[in-house]
Structure formats: structure tokens, C-alpha cells
Interface confidence: medium
């Protein structure tokens, strides 16, 4: 059962796992949310009757029932972690402690002009977990403005004392704010020489690159495979680090992948979601339950209900053997990975999907895509909407894209004429413009920002926001599109489609069905070259066939360019302006998103 | 201490090339990262190019991906950029920069060089 609220004077006595120490009851319950076994907690506010040193301390505590007997005492507070819910989670804390010195190992000291200056500063250091900051009121006049990076082997700090002058926060790498680089790529027969600060199990190099990029101090990983010679350690997941943040040798090594931690773009990857099954694969482990299941999917199934299961392995059933149910084993460890994988046994194994929730929504798994024809699937797009004017008759206007639960992104040009938000009318979840009716349910926009450089599509900033009246609840039909990471920009897109309910041909009418395009990225130099008369900026990025044949047209404006990178899709472009529509060596332009990351999180993010 | 010279700017045609070398000395081994960092007229510093010094790691802006190449010589403590295909868009102050992240933040890095002005122009 989700419980959210917090219990103000209650204590929770024993299931204790560990204690660290936290700024606020509310981020003890995200630490607990993403502990691996935390089910509960209780925290410590400061206060006059209570023991200074055990001020601002998170008991983590687990429980075989989800509940622990509750006492009373004063400046304690209590909860429950999210796991048992269903809503989205994020780490993201944007929070500034005033007062508090968050204590860690002090490894860099610099002036500063301000908090945010300070906090930018950790956001961009590899190893900054959190910082404080001694402002300019701070007695100690050789430290006024000093900006201290911190960080420890948890990620929270060592202790919190009250400090006055001084204010306290966290890096906002997992706010996607960072400017560090992004390195995707695994490296084969490859071994990183550094020193190791963990070690898991883990089934396959992916899994164990998102188990370093979730580690507060793992920054690249090697994974030795089941094939590995010595057997002891095959699938073992070795979390690494260094000084510079980077590996300082490569050694070649055959059955040996390795590969770095992606916390600078964790908001467009799944990070705690392993979905793969794993065949012939044994998963050991605290067993937790044994379940009879018709399926390994119905095993995956029971764990994600179990909150307690981490992981599972399926034992499939002997011919005609227990109505053909199998065994399904639920599973647990101190670190939510297996304690040992096993090979050869007929087993199949898995994680639980309960923690995909506290990855960005945009990471999940859509429906698989029809290959060939043009018209689109219901739920094949989605993050595409239908943005319509009511004024002076209701009509299709533009596309755009959910990005947020109430953020739409689209074209500034769309608004050409638009006078008030009031007029617009947003649908999701659409196919067939023809399902809109008098009373189909729509969100209503609040607000429309439109990127203050915007003067026509053509000179660039052809980007705009709106605000929708309320939150949308995502399905399978309406979900939001990753954002591109800033970090990201080695990765090459092979797979982007264009998708709107534009016109099909230069003197046409707007479509029924919502229509799909595969179109290969053009580099803007080519672009360059067919637009002579205008200025291809960076900001843009075209796409295209040289033949022409297939391209967005009037009425797909403001809709998504969406490419497909490593099972996850992302929103690259952003329908603007070509010449014509699928002309011979006319690419369509389109705003290129990932220039306009800082700008779209500004907006969004504004308290 | 970290010195970083930067030397091969010049005035070159659309379409012609350049090789920018940057002349690293003093305690080198102690960055992790270099890049090349540029500054058009009356524009902020932006990324082009990143090196992870040891491991040889590369990362480019998509303004310049398959048109520049940065390079290093150990050897020679000895960090390149060969730029092809230039643009009008590619003048500007081009700086070398030494640090311990591998990041496209200018506040990264540590140590700068002088900078050396490249202008496309016909």
C-alpha cells in the first residue's frame, strides 16, 4: 500500500538497516525510496530536546510485514519509502539548506559569487555529490563566498551540523543539468586499470553499466562475461573510479567489456529498469518466496508485486508436472543484485520492474513499431499531439510533443496569429483526427512561452513551450519523449522518423490518420548546400532523402523529428520550415532540440 | 603549474583547412581532459572538441563532427585540431584548455591558453 504522508512525532522501532544523514525528512524518504531495501525510515529533525548529534540522522529500517511498531517521540518523523507506489520518482533535489553544513570529504575549495554559481560548479564536477557555501554574511572573512565540492562513499553526507551563514545542496547531475560528458559506448575485450570501489554480479555488461551509473561513486565499470577464464570471476560487475574522473588505462582483454557511469544524461537511459530475460541463468540469492507460475513473465509479474523482491529465477515445469506451472523463485540481497549467477541450469532469471517507476518515463518501452506503410498504429507515437484552434472554427493546427506531465514542446511559428492560449485545445492519444469530437476530452494551455530570439522559423528559434491546465496521466497511449542529453553529443541517430497529419503533398489537406516518415539525418553542411540563401545554424538540423519522397509538410509543424538510440526514443528535432515538401535535395529543417536543453529545463523547471 | 600555447590560426578560405597545435608544459600528468574551446565575435565560449588524455576518449559538438579531428602527440606534450571543410561560421578565437573533467563546461578546466584567431573568409 503507497503511503505518502509523513508521520510528524513517531518513531518506527527496529528493522534497522543503516543510518546516514539527510537535510529533511523528505529527502530521508528518497534515500530510502532508493535504497534497495529500504521499506521505511525514520528521520530526525533538529530540536531543542533531542541530542544534537543525532540531529538530521535517516534510519533506514526494513520489515518481513512493510510495517514496524510505532512510538512516540518528539522531532522524530516517519514514512514510508515510494517503492510501494505507482507514481514517478525522481532524485532531483533543487532544494538550498540554509544554515546547515553538510559534512563529506572536502576535495575542492574556489570562490564563488553565489549559491548557484556553487551548485552549478558541483553539477559539472565528476565527483561532486554536494556542497556548502559560505555566504557573504559568514564571519570568517577568508572564507566568505568559498564554494566547497564534497563527497562521500554514500552520496549523503557524513554528518549535518548547523552552521550559520553557510547554505547546503545537492549536485543536480540527476536534474539533467550537467555539463559533463557523456561516453555510451561499451568497449569490447576491454579492461579499465583503476581502483575498484564496489563489486556486484551482474548478468551482462548493460545491467552493470546501470548499476555503476545509480552508484554515488562509480564513475566506469568493467564487467567480466561468462566467458571469462577465471570462473570466479565471470559476470562480476567491478564499479570503478579515479582522480580525473576517467580510466587511466585501457588494458586489452579478451571476454572483458567496460564502459562508463552515464549519470550525466541518466534522465534519457534507464538506470534501475532491467527488463531482459536471462536464459539458462540462475539467479542466487535470500530467498523470499517460492511461487508456482504458468510463465517467466508471470514470475516477473509476482516479483514486481512482491515489494520486497529484487530479483527471481523461473524453473520452467517437467511435462504435465503441476497443472504445467513452474517454480518461481523471489529473491532479495543487501544490494538488490544477485549473490552469485549461475550458468547450464535451465533457470530463467530477471529483476523486478517495480523500480522502472524512478526512472524518467520517457525511457520506457513502447509497442513495436509496424515496419512499412505510412499510417501509424495507435500507441506506435506516444508522445505526438494534435494541437488545435478553436478560433474561428476548431481546426488542426500543429503537432507537438509531451515532454512533462504538463509540458508540450512544439514551434514557435505555430503561433502566428494566436492571441490567447485560451483558444487552443491540446490532444493526446489520438490516431484518427475524426475521433475528436464535441466531447472528447482535451487539456487546456495555460501558457504558451515562445523562445525570445524567435523571429521567423527561417533565422532559427523556432521552439515554444506550453503550459497545460492540467496534468496528463501517462498510458500507453500518451507518454512523454525523452529530451537529447547536452552530454550526448557523440551519439550518430540511425533510426528517426517524422510523424504528423500534414498534408501528404504541397497542395494537399490535413490527414486522418497520423502518418510516419523514416528519414535519414542530413549533416548540416550538406544542408548548407541546399539552402544557399539561408543561414543553416547549429541550432538546426535537417533530414531527408536526396531524392526527396518522403518529408513533413504543411500542418506537421511543430511535431517531432523522434530517433530511436539504444531502445530509447528521443525528441531530435522539431518539425520548422524546408522548401516545399519532399523535393529533390530539399531537406526538411528542424529545429535541433538538444541546443535548447538549458532553455526547455529553465522554463519547465521554474519554481 | 600548466602552461598551454596555442599557435596555427589564420585567415583561410571557405573549404580550405588549418591545424591548430597547443604546446602543453609543466605538470601535465595531472589533467585528465583537454579541449579545444572557441569564441566567435560578440558570442560566449563554446565546446569543440574533447580529449581524455590517457585513456584517448573523443567527443566533438555536432557543428563540427566529421569536419574537425583533435588529436594528441605524448611525445610531444602536444595537442592538435585538424579542421577540413571550413566554414564562415568557424571564425573565431580558438583556446586550448587543460583540466580534470572530461566536460563540455568552460569551468572545468583549470589552465587556458592564449587563444590564436582563425578566420574563414573569401
Known amino acids: 500500500e503507497c503511503v505518502t504522508q509523513l508521520l510528524k512525532d513517531t518513531c518506527f522501532e527496529g528493522g534497522d538497516i543503516t543510518t546516514v544523514f539527510t537535510p529533511s525528512a523528505k529527502y530521508c524518504q528518497v534515500v530510502c525510496t532508493y535504497h534497495p531495501r529500504c521499506l521505511l525510515f525514520t528521520f530526525t529533525a533538529e530540536s531543542p530536546s533531542e541530542d544534537p548529534t543525532r540531529w538530521f540522522t535517516c534510519v533506514l529500517k526494513d520489515s518481513v510485514t512493510e510495517t514496524l511498531p510505532r512510538v512516540n517521540r518528539t522531532a522524530a518523523i516517519s514514512g514510508y519509502s515510494f517503492k510501494q507506489c505507482s507514481h514517478q520518482i525522481s532524485a532531483c533535489n533543487k532544494d538550498i539548506y540554509v544554515d546547515l553544513d553538510m559534512k563529506g570529504i572536502n576535495y575542492n575549495s574556489s570562490v564563488a559569487k553565489s549559491a548557484q554559481e556553487c551548485q552549478e560548479r558541483c553539477t559539472d564536477d565528476v565527483h561532486c555529490h554536494f556542497f556548502t557555501y559560505a555566504t557573504r554574511q559568514f564571519p570568517s572573512l577568508e572564507h566568505r563566498n568559498i564554494c566547497l565540492l564534497k563527497h562521500t562513499q554514500t552520496g549523503t553526507p557524513t554528518r549535518i551540523t548547523k552552521l550559520d551563514k553557510v547554505v547546503s545542496g545537492f549536485s543536480l547531475k540527476s536534474c539533467a543539468l550537467s555539463n559533463l560528458a557523456c561516453i555510451r559506448d561499451i568497449f569490447p575485450n576491454t579492461v579499465f586499470a583503476d581502483s575498484n570501489i564496489d563489486s556486484v554480479m551482474a548478468p551482462d555488461a548493460f545491467v552493470c553499466g546501470r548499476i555503476c551509473t545509480h552508484h554515488p561513486g562509480c564513475l566506469f565499470f568493467t564487467f567480466f562475461s561468462q566467458e571469462w577464464p577465471k570462473e570466479s570471476q565471470r559476470n562480476l560487475c567491478l564499479l570503478k573510479t579515479s582522480e580525473s574522473g576517467l580510466p587511466s588505462t585501457r588494458i586489452k582483454k579478451s571476454k572483458a567489456l567496460s564502459g562508463f557511469s552515464l549519470q550525466s544524461c541518466r534522465h534519457s537511459i534507464p538506470v534501475f529498469c532491467h527488463s531482459s530475460f536471462y536464459h539458462d541463468t540462475d539467479f542466487l540469492g535470500e530467498e523470499l518466496d517460492i511461487v508456482a507460475a504458468k510463465s517467466h513473465e508471470a514470475c516477473q509479474k509476482l516479483c514486481t508485486n512482491a515489494v520486497r523482491c529484487q530479483f527471481f529465477t523461473y524453473t520452467p515445469a517437467q511435462a504435465s508436472c503441476n497443472e504445467g506451472k513452474g517454480k518461481c523463485y523471489l529473491k532479495l540481497s543487501s544490494n538488490g543484485s544477485p549473490t552469485k549467477i549461475l550458468h547450464g541450469r535451465g533457470g530463467i532469471s530477471g529483476y523486478t520492474l517495480r523500480l522502472c517507476k524512478m526512472d524518467n518515463e520517457c525511457t520506457t518501452k513502447i509497442k513495436p513499431r509496424i515496419v512499412g506503410g505510412t499510417a501509424s498504429v495507435r500507441g506506435e507515437w506516444p508522445w505526438q499531439v494534435t494541437l488545435h484552434t478553436t478560433s474561428p472554427t476548431q481546426r488542426h493546427l500543429c503537432g507537438g510533443s509531451i515532454i512533462g506531465n504538463q509540458w508540450i514542446l512544439t514551434a514557435a511559428h505555430c503561433f502566428y496569429g494566436v492571441e490567447s492560449p485560451k483558444i487552443l485545445r491540446v490532444y493526446s492519444g489520438i490516431l484518427n483526427q475524426s475521433e475528436i469530437k464535441e466531447d472528447t476530452s482535451f487539456f487546456g494551455v495555460q501558457e504558451i512561452i515562445i523562445h525570445d530570439q524567435y523571429k521567423m522559423a527561417e533565422s532559427g528559434y523556432d521552439i515554444a513551450l506550453l503550459k497545460l491546465e492540467t496534468t496528463v496521466n501517462y498510458t500507453d497511449s500518451q507518454r512523454p519523449i525523452c529530451l537529447p542529453s547536452k552530454g550526448d553529443r557523440n551519439v550518430i541517430y540511425t533510426d528517426c522518423w517524422v510523424t504528423g497529419w500534414g498534408y501528404r503533398k504541397l497542395r494537399d489537406k490535413i490527414q486522418n490518420t497520423l502518418q510516419k516518415a523514416k528519414i535519414p539525418l542530413v549533416t548540416n553542411e550538406e544542408c548548407q548546400k541546399r539552402y544557399r540563401g539561408h543561414k543553416i545554424t547549429h541550432k538546426m538540423i535537417c533530414a531527408g532523402y536526396r531524392e526527396g519522397g518522403k518529408d513533413a509538410c504543411k500542418g506537421d509543424s511543430g511535431g517531432p523529428l523522434s530517433c530511436k538510440h539504444n531502445e530509447v526514443w528521443h525528441l531530435v528535432g522539431i518539425t520548422s520550415w524546408g522548401e516545399g515538401c519532399a523535393q529533390r535535395e530539399r531537406p526538411g529543417v528542424y529545429t535541433n532540440v538538444v541546443e535548447y536543453v538549458d532553455w526547455i529545463l529553465e522554463k519547465t523547471q521554474a519554481v | 603549474q600548466v602552461q598551454l600555447v596555442e599557435s596555427g590560426g589564420g585567415l583561410v578560405q571557405p573549404g580550405g583547412s588549418l591545424r591548430l597545435s597547443c604546446a602543453a608544459s609543466?605538470?601535465?600528468?595531472?589533467?585528465?581532459?583537454m579541449a579545444w574551446f572557441r569564441q566567435a565575435p560578440g558570442k560566449g565560449l563554446e565546446g569543440v572538441s574533447l580529449?581524455?588524455?590517457?585513456?584517448?576518449?573523443?567527443s566533438y559538438t555536432d557543428s563540427v563532427k566529421g569536419r574537425f579531428t583533435i588529436s594528441q602527440d605524448n611525445s610531444k606534450n602536444t595537442l592538435y585540431l585538424q579542421m577540413n571543410s571550413l566554414k564562415p561560421e568557424d571564425t573565431a578565437v580558438y583556446y586550448c584548455?587543460?583540466?580534470?573533467?572530461?566536460?563540455?563546461?568552460?569551468?572545468?578546466?583549470?589552465?587556458w591558453g592564449q587563444g590564436t584567431l582563425v578566420t574563414v573568409s573569401s
Open positions: 584548455a587543460a583540466g580534470t573533467q572530461f566536460s563540455w563546461s568552460p569551468g572545468s578546466y583549470n589552465y
Open positions: 580529449i581524455a588524455t590517457s585513456s584517448g576518449f573523443i
Open positions: 609543466g605538470y601535465t600528468y595531472s589533467m585528465g581532459a
